[in-house]
Interface confidence: medium
């Protein structure tokens, strides 16, 4: 079956750059099938814009102003790629890639759409540094203690774009567990945004990650915060700086027992 | 032109009751027509639900019943029994894919309906509040409530900031809130919740342990993509309460 | 009415490879599915795959995945079977056909239009 | 895959008399679109074959009256009222309800 996969959730942009966006097929060989964008302005019907049909033949939506949208595939990394030239406000929109997946029966096919790229344009120079910083909070103790269940939750601050995707999963899991999360609010010029995990008392030891996509995440991947079990044995040290470095430095962990 | 006219723009439906969404095909007979139905949740996911010729996207077929009336011209997806997944927005769209002649194999999309979901009526429930905190934040975590309406209130002499709550529905059926919040005094913030016209306060909840019972971090950025700045306590920590823990992430 | 015409009897070696092409006139070729069948000398027909030109999106049935690539121009309305790794069982006639017309569109499927047929002999 | 069986393997008729073939197929070949996907196939010697019967009982254009089609879910027969010389050949059941379309082994009929 065919999968798409827009590796960018946002793509910010300033008046009058050209934004690239990428559709990643898998499962289907992308010189095999084609790839359809439709863009979703905020308020208006989704609609169809351009696609690629798997000899090459691009076709347009009637209307489409010519030499705004590019469209083209790269079947070495099986990926599509939609070009925006002179980006201006009325492109602010959420561009999905789409293609036809045929099913077991005959005579089945449906359209299947990728996760979306928003399109973000902004006129504001902004900090150097606008990733999402996360805090964590392990669960209380009263609740661990009467519910037999704890709640880890995951603060994210200071981003921009207000674009942003949390999920969690137990350490050496690929499950995505059930999450629940508060609206993105604005604050100043950045977002924050929370969400968190219920778990029963047995995954409590159980490391748990938070996961977070963002445009502008260190490196372009997925942020992963980690929540360690909360029934561990603890090591006294030296008290330093509570900072994190690099990916593999050694990180230091303030602890305190909360009794509420 | 053909235009696809959703019935309602927000359509509220209780969890396990039948909804029904309908659309209506302007411009054009919708027999010559196949139609699609899909629904975006947060997060922009579009999934494929249902398409003409029974053809029903993973998960969907169970719940959903996808249907063509010819002579209102309309189509209609019914929700037989909603859960709280089910949120989201739900978009008819229409091709020619298959009819006879050149294929049209673009969709055409009507506007979307906004179907929300909410608890079945049930006997009220008081929440459970506990509070959790990392150096100045402060959340408070209310927990299986009905009906919806509360007032969270974060106790503090000392607020920096605080944030409108969150409330979702929980997997039981009923509601879960947290609300986010700065403070100088963050270890004296306690939460107070209005509810049903009674008060429950985090502190009725609290056990009574000795300080080695439970340990838990008090605040950090335990991330493989660290950020540049760093968080220091301001709350006063008192030391025979403290343990210092070495992770390697 | 659409017509089918293959290209010609071929002899291959074993494990070479073997591309057979199939040109439709008039009609619709980007609309209808194009089969390939085999059959080998004294045996029934065997289904080896299929592709609607429009999508471009080919089907093969399990035993060739892999051994099989069916692709479609539609600039010069020709369907095209490669079949690699020959062995000597794959000496057979070849068909293109297509189901041009009395349904829908993914039913390959009426089957109502044949090629000529295109010999493959594998021998050393 | 669905598996097409057909009997008989071979059937010498008389000219001018019935003719039945059966076809069996190791699942419904009833399509969610309400529709059966089974075709009938005929071969004469040295041809590509031809359509005969589409959806169990669809005559395709330009084939004779003498042969029908009958049948539902998975069991089906074609039958030729009465044969004549240019009948002679092997016939095939064919399923296309799903992938990959597969074919029975297919019946010969000849005059005895």
């Known amino acids: 079956a065919g999968h798409l996969e827009q590796p960018q959730i946002s793509s910010t942009k300033t008046l009058s750059k050209t934004a690239r966006l990428e559709c990643v097929v898998s499962g289907i060989t992308i010189s095999a099938t084609s790839v359809y964008w439709y863009r979703e302005r905020p308020g208006e019907v989704i609609q169809f814009l351009v696609s690629i049909s798997y000899d090459g033949t691009v076709r347009k939506e009637s209307g489409i102003p010519s030499g705004k949208f590019e469209v083209d595939r790269i079947p070495e990394t099986s990926t599509s790629t939609l070009t925006i030239h002179n980006v201006e406000k009325q492109d602010i929109a959420t561009y999905y890639c789409a293609l036809w997946e045929a099913q077991q029966e005959l005579g089945k096919k449906i359209k299947v759409f990728g996760p979306g790229t928003k399109l973000i344009i902004t006129d504001k120079q902004l900090d150097a540094d606008v990733s999402p910083k996360p805090t964590i909070f392990l669960p209380s103790i009263a609740e661990t203690k009467l519910q037999k269940a704890g709640t880890y939750l995951c603060l994210l601050e200071k981003f921009f774009p207000d674009v942003i995707k949390i999920h969690w999963q137990e350490k050496k899991s690929n499950t995505i567990l059930g999450s629940q999360e508060g609206n993105t609010m604005k604050t100043n010029d950045t977002y924050m945004k929370f969400s968190w995990l219920t778990v029963p008392e047995k995954s409590l030891d159980k490391e748990h990650r938070c996961i977070v996509r963002h445009e502008n995440n260190k490196n372009g991947v997925d942020q992963e915060i980690i929540f360690p079990p909360i029934k561990t044995d603890v090591i006294t040290m030296d008290p330093k700086d509570n900072c994190s470095k690099d990916a593999n430095d050694t990180l230091l962990l303030q602890l305190t027992n909360t009794s509420a | 032109a053909i235009e696809l006219v959703p019935e309602h723009q927000t359509v509220p439906v209780s969890i396990g009751v039948p909804a029904t969404l309908r659309c209506s095909m302007k411009g054009e007979a919708i027999g010559n027509y196949y139609i699609n139905w899909y629904r975006k949740t947060q997060g922009n996911t579009m999934t494929f639900i249902y398409r003409e010729k029974d053809i029903y996207g993973p998960g969907f077929k169970d719940n959903f019943q996808g249907d063509i009336d010819i002579a209102k011209n309309l189509a209609v997806l019914k929700i037989l029994a909603p859960s709280e997944r089910d949120e989201g927005s739900y978009y008819c769209a229409c091709d020619t894919l298959g009819m006879g002649g050149e294929y049209t194999d673009k969709l055409i999309f009507g506007k979307g309906t906004r179907v929300t979901v909410e608890p079945r009526s049930q006997p009220h429930t008081k929440p459970s509040v506990f509070v959790m905190k990392n150096g100045t934040n402060v959340a408070c975590l209310v927990k299986e409530f009905y009906p919806k309406d509360i007032r969270i209130n974060l106790v503090s002499s000392k607020k920096i900031t605080e944030f409108d709550p969150a409330i979702v529905i929980s997997p039981s059926g009923k509601y879960n809130a947290v609300k986010l919040g700065k403070y100088e005094d963050s270890n004296s913030v306690t939460c107070s919740v209005q509810h049903d016209n009674k008060t429950v306060h985090s502190t009725d909840f609290e056990v009574k342990t000795d300080s080695t019972d439970h340990v838990k971090p008090k605040e950090t950025e335990n991330t493989k993509q660290p950020s540049k700045s760093c968080h220091k306590p301001k709350a006063i920590v008192h030391t025979e309460k403290v343990n210092m823990m070495s992770l390697t992430v | 009415q659409v017509q089918l015409v293959q290209s010609g009897a071929e002899v291959k070696k074993p494990g070479s490879s073997v591309k057979v092409s199939c040109k439709a006139s008039?009609?619709?070729?980007?609309?209808?599915?194009i089969s390939w069948m085999r059959q080998a000398p004294g045996q029934g027909l065997e289904w080896m795959g299929g592709?609607?030109?429009?999508?471009?999106?080919?089907d093969y049935a399990q035993k060739f995945q892999g051994r099989v690539t069916i692709t479609a121009d539609k600039s010069t309305s020709t369907a095209y079977m490669e079949l690699s790794s020959l062995r000597s069982e794959d000496t057979a006639v070849y068909y293109c056909?297509?189901?041009?017309?009395?349904?829908?569109?993914?039913?390959?499927?009426?089957?109502?239009?044949w090629g000529q047929g295109t010999m493959v002999t594998v021998s050393s | 895959d669905i598996v097409m069986t057909q009997s008989p393997l071979s059937s010498p008729v008389d000219l001018g008399q019935p003719a039945s073939i059966s076809c069996r197929s190791s699942?419904?070949?009833?399509?969610?679109?309400?529709?059966?996907?089974l075709s009938w196939l005929q071969q004469r010697p040295g041809q590509p074959p031809r359509l005969l019967i589409y959806?169990?009982?669809n005559r395709f254009s330009g084939v004779p009256d003498r042969f029908s089609g009958s049948g539902a879910g998975t069991d089906f027969t074609l039958k030729i009222s009465r044969v004549e010389a240019e009948d002679v050949g092997v016939y095939y059941c064919?399923?296309?309800?799903?992938?990959?379309?597969?074919l029975g082994g297919g019946t010969k009929v000849d005059i005895k």
């Open positions: 056909s297509t189901g041009g017309g009395y349904g829908d569109y993914d039913y390959y499927y009426g089957i109502n239009v």
């Open positions: 008039g009609g619709s070729f980007s609309n209808y599915a």
């Open positions: 699942q419904s070949l009833v399509h969610s679109d309400g529709n059966t996907y």
């Open positions: 592709i609607i030109p429009f999508f471009g999106t080919p």
């Open positions: 959806k169990i009982s």
């Open positions: 064919m399923q296309a309800k799903e992938f990959p379309l597969t």
